[in-house]
Amino acid sequence: FSPLRRISIKILVHSLFSMLIMCTILTNCIFMTMNNPPDWTKNVEYTFTGIYTFESLVKILARGFCVGEFTFLRDPWNWLDFVVIVFAYLTEFVNLGNVSALRTFRVLRALKTISVIPGLKTIVGALIQSVKKLSDVMILTVFCLSVFALIGLQLFMGNLKHKCFRNSLENNETLESIMNTLESEEDFRKYFYYLEGSKDALLCGFSTDSGQCPEGYTCVKIGRNPDYGYTSFDTFSWAFLALFRLMTQDYWENLYQQTLRAAGKTYMIFFVVVIFLGSFYLINLILAVVAMAYEEQNQ
C-alpha cells in the first residue's frame, strides 16, 4: 500500500471522520431549509461541496474506484455520494439553462444521512429488500384490483352521472338547451337538486332500491361525474382508481354511498367483497411481507 492509501484508510476508519461528515450533512440540511439565504451562504455551499469531494476522494483512495470487489462504486450507497458531487459541480460550473430543476437534486444530500447512521441503513435495507419481495404480492394486488375494476365497470358504468333534474322547465326549455347554456355553479343549482352543503347534484337511480328524487324532480343521466368528475366507473382507469380507493379505505364510505344511491342497495355485496379481500386481506399480506423482510434484514 502506498503512503497516500494508508493515510486514506486511517482517515476513513476514524470515528471523527464519520462525525465530521454527519455534522456536515445535518448543517447542510439546515441551510437548505432557508427561504431567502444570504449571499454568504454561497461560500458555505462551496465548503460543503469541498467536504463531500474530500470524503469521496478518501474513499476512492482507500478502496479504489471501480475495479475490484470492495471498491468505491461497488457499494450502492456510494452511488448516492457520487451523484451528489456530480450535480454539485454541474449546477455550479455548467450553464444548463433551467438550473432550478437541477438544484432540486441538492436535496439528495439529505439522503447521505442514511449511509452514515447504521440504524437507518438497516431500515432502508429492509425497505429495499421488502420491495423486491413485494413484487409477487403487488402482481396479485394489481390483478385483484383489475378484476374488480372490470366488474365495477360492468355494474356501475355511467351510474354516477344520474342526477335529479327539475321537471318544471320554462315552456321553451329542453334538457339539451339547458345543458348547452349551463356555465356556473348557480346555473346547475337552478336545474338540479342539491342537498344542503353539497357540492354535487343529488344522485339517483332507476332501480326500485336506488335513491329516488324529491317531488318536482326526475332522474336523468346527464352532465359530469361527482367530485369534479374524478369519481366514476366509466372507464377501466377510473374504475381501477375507485377500487384502489376502496382498498386503501380513502374516504371509501362516500364512494360506497354514492354508488349505492345510483345503482341500488343490492350492490353492497360488491363493496363487502372488495373491502374484505382488498382492504383486510391484501393490505395485511403486504404488511406481512414488509415485516418478514425487516426481520430477515435484522438477522
Epitope: M157, G158, H162, F165, N167, S168, L169, T174, L175, E176, F206, E215, G216, T218, C219, V220, K221, I222
Partner: nanobody, 124 residues
C-alpha cells in the same frame, strides 16, 4: 330507440272536442315530463300544455280552462283532452318528452324526444 307517436287528430267543428294521445315506446326507464306544442301554418311553434312525472300540470293562457292534460304512467302515454275548440286551434300538434331510456349496448341515455305530429283542423 325511443319513439313518440301522436294520434287522435282530425277535423272537428268549432265548439267540438278531441282527445289527442302521445305514446312513448322503447326501453324507457323514466319520463320526466311530457309536453304538447302546436304549430299553425305560417306561425311559430307554441307551447300548449305539460305534465311532469309527479303529475304537476301547466297550460298556455290561450287554452286554460278548455284543454286538460293527463297521463297514464304505466303505458308511458300522455293525453290532451281538447274541449270548446276554436278555428284558431287549427295546427299540427306535437308531443315532446324528457325520457331516460336504456339504449344500444345497455347504456342509459337521457334526452328530449319529439313526435312527428298529428293534425287538428277546426272548421265548420
Amino acid at each position: 330507440e325511443v319513439q313518440l307517436v301522436e294520434s287522435g287528430g282530425g277535423v272537428v267543428q268549432p265548439g267540438g272536442s278531441l282527445r289527442l294521445s302521445c305514446a312513448a315506446s322503447g326501453r324507457i326507464l323514466r319520463i320526466g315530463y311530457m309536453r304538447w306544442y302546436r304549430q299553425a301554418p305560417g306561425k311559430q311553434r307554441e307551447f300548449v300544455a305539460r305534465i311532469t312525472d309527479d303529475s304537476a300540470t301547466g297550460y298556455a293562457d290561450s287554452v286554460k280552462g278548455r284543454f286538460t292534460i293527463s297521463r297514464d304512467a304505466a303505458k308511458n302515454t300522455v293525453y290532451l283532452q281538447m274541449n270548446s275548440l276554436r278555428p284558431e286551434d287549427t295546427a299540427l300538434y306535437y308531443c315532446e318528452a324528457l325520457v331516460t331510456a336504456s339504449v344500444r349496448g345497455g347504456s342509459i341515455h337521457s334526452g328530449t324526444y319529439w313526435g312527428q305530429g298529428t293534425l287538428v283542423t277546426v272548421s265548420s
